[in-house]
C-alpha cells in the first residue's frame, strides 16, 4: 500500500483523520519538510525577543533581541544586556574595565592590554579602557642614530 503522506509538500501535513489528505498547516504552525504527519507550533518571539523573521507555513519564526541587548546561545535563545565600549557585564550590571584592560565592543569581557615588550617592541600609543595599546618598533630601533622612518623617495 502506497504511503500517500510522502506526497504532502512542506507547508502541509498528512491528515490521517481525512484519509491521508494533505491539509494546510493551521495558523501559527509550520512544516519545513514534506511528508510530515503534524505541523510544529511556531517559535514565539516574546518579551525581550523581537521577531526577525515571521513564521510561515514552511519555516519557523526567527528571533532577535530588543535594542540594548544582543543574542546569545543557539537560535538566539537568550538576550544579554549591552554595555558601552570600555565596560564589561557583571552580575551587578555594566562595570568599567580595570586599569590595564580594555573592551572595544558592547559585549564580552575586558581583556588585558597587549604586552609589547614580549615581542621586543615598545608602546607607541597607550591603551585606554576602550582600546588596546599600539606596539611600535623595538626600543633598539629607536636608539639615537637609528633611522626611525623610511627615507623619502627621490624627487623626479
Amino acid at each position: 500500500l502506497q504511503d500517500l503522506c510522502s506526497n504532502c509538500p512542506a507547508g502541509t501535513f498528512c491528515d490521517n483523520n481525512r484519509s491521508q489528505i494533505c491539509s494546510p498547516c493551521p495558523p501559527n504552525s509550520f512544516s519545513s519538510a514534506g511528508g510530515q504527519r503534524t505541523c510544529d507550533i511556531c517559535r514565539q518571539c516574546k518579551g525581550v525577543f523581537k521577531t526577525r523573521k515571521e513564521c510561515s507555513s514552511t519555516s519557523n519564526a526567527e528571533c532577535d533581541c530588543i535594542s540594548g541587548y544582543h543574542c546569545l546561545g543557539a537560535e538566539c535563545s537568550m538576550c544579554e544586556q549591552d554595555c558601552k565600549q570600555g565596560q564589561e557585564l557583571t552580575k551587578k550590571g555594566c562595570k568599567d574595565c580595570c586599569f590595564g584592560t580594555f573592551n572595544d565592543q558592547k559585549r564580552g569581557i575586558c581583556r588585558p592590554w597587549t604586552n609589547c615588550s614580549l615581542d621586543g617592541k615598545s608602546v607607541l600609543v597607550n591603551g585606554t579602557k576602550e582600546r588596546d595599546v599600539v606596539c611600535g618598533p623595538s626600543p633598539a630601533d629607536l636608539s639615537p642614530g637609528a633611522s626611525s622612518a623610511t627615507p623619502p623617495a627621490p624627487a623626479r
Epitope: T38, D40, I41, C42, R43, Q44, K46, G47, V48, F49, I66, S67, G68, Y69, L72, G73, A74, E75, S77, M78, C79, E80, Q81, L89, T90, K91, G93
Partner: antibody, heavy 123, light 106 residues
Framework: EVQLVESGGGLVQPGGSLRLSCAAS??????????VGWIRQAPGKGLEWLAL???????YYSPSLKSRLTISRDNSKNTLYLQLNSLRAEDTAVYYC???????????????WGQGTLVTVSS | DIQLTQSPSSLSASVGDRVTITCRAS??????LAWYQQKPGKAPKLLIY???SLESGVPSRFSGSGSGTDFTLTISSLQPEDFATYYC????????FGQGTKVEIK
C-alpha cells in the same frame, strides 16, 4: 536585591472574583526587557503558567484560562496584578508571581519567585 | 499547546547516587528549556536554563543536557538537600511546565 511579595489570597466563593497583587522591589517593572508573570500550583499538583506582562505592556495568557484572566500593573507602585473571574473549586491553589530571566541574561525562564499566596475557592 | 512529559513521576534514591530525570516535549523546543527544584511549602528555584546553562549559585552537581524534544537533568551525586520535586519548563511558545518528578529517600 530582587524581591516579589504576593498578597490578596484567601477564601473566595465559587463564581466570585479575586484580585491578587505582587509588589516588586529591587527592579522596575518598566525596565526594558523585564517580564513578570503568574504561575499557580493546586494542592499536591504541579505548576501551571497563567499569564505574563512585559515592560512595554504586551500581555500573554494561558489559552485555557484566557477568558477568565486579566493581568495588569501599576508602574507608580511597581506592582503587578492578576484578576481571575468566575472562580471554581479547581482554582484553589497557591498563586506565585515570578520574574522572567536572570540578572543580566534574559530569556524564557523564571529566576525570581515570590513566596506565593493561597487562594481557596469554597462555599 | 506544547506538552512536556517528565519521567519518572517519582523515584527513590540514596545519598551519593547519580540521578537522571528526563523531559520529553510534544515537539522541538530546543534550546528553550529550564529546570526547577521545589521543596514542600517553598517556591520553585531555577537550576538550569537554556537546556544546559547552570544558574548562578547552583551547585555544579546539577547539569542539563539535550536538544530537540528530549532533555535530561542529572544530579551527579545526590545530597540530602536534593530530595525535592523537579520540574521542566519550556519557553519556546508561551510557557508550560512538566508534571514534576519527586525524588524521595530510599
Amino acid at each position: 536585591e530582587v524581591q516579589l511579595v504576593e498578597s490578596g489570597g484567601g477564601l473566595v466563593q465559587p463564581g466570585g472574583s479575586l484580585r491578587l497583587s505582587c509588589a516588586a522591589s529591587g527592579f522596575s517593572l518598566s525596565t526594558s526587557g523585564v517580564g513578570v508573570g503568574w504561575i499557580r500550583q493546586a494542592p499536591g499538583k504541579g505548576l501551571e503558567w497563567l499569564a505574563l506582562i512585559d515592560w512595554d505592556d504586551d500581555k500573554y495568557y494561558s489559552p485555557s484560562l484566557k477568558s477568565r484572566l486579566t493581568i495588569s500593573r501599576d508602574n507608580s507602585k511597581n506592582t503587578l496584578y492578576l484578576q481571575l473571574n468566575s472562580l471554581r473549586a479547581e482554582d484553589t491553589a497557591v498563586y506565585y508571581c515570578a520574574r522572567g530571566g536572570s540578572d543580566t541574561v534574559l530569556g524564557d525562564w523564571f529566576a525570581y519567585w515570590g513566596q506565593g499566596t493561597l487562594v481557596t475557592v469554597s462555599s | 499547546d506544547i506538552q512536556l512529559t517528565q519521567s519518572p513521576s517519582s523515584l527513590s534514591a540514596s545519598v551519593g547516587d547519580r540521578v537522571t530525570i528526563t523531559c520529553r516535549a510534544s515537539q522541538s523546543v530546543s534550546p528553550y528549556l529550564a529546570w526547577y527544584q521545589q521543596k514542600p511549602g517553598k517556591a520553585p528555584k531555577l537550576l538550569i536554563y537554556d537546556a544546559s546553562s547552570l544558574e548562578s549559585g547552583v551547585p555544579s552537581r546539577f547539569s542539563g543536557s539535550g536538544s530537540g524534544t528530549d532533555f535530561t537533568l542529572t544530579i551527579s551525586s545526590l545530597q540530602p538537600e536534593d530530595f525535592a520535586t523537579y520540574y521542566c519548563q519550556q519557553g519556546y511558545s508561551l510557557w508550560t511546565f512538566g508534571q514534576g518528578t519527586k525524588v524521595e529517600i530510599k
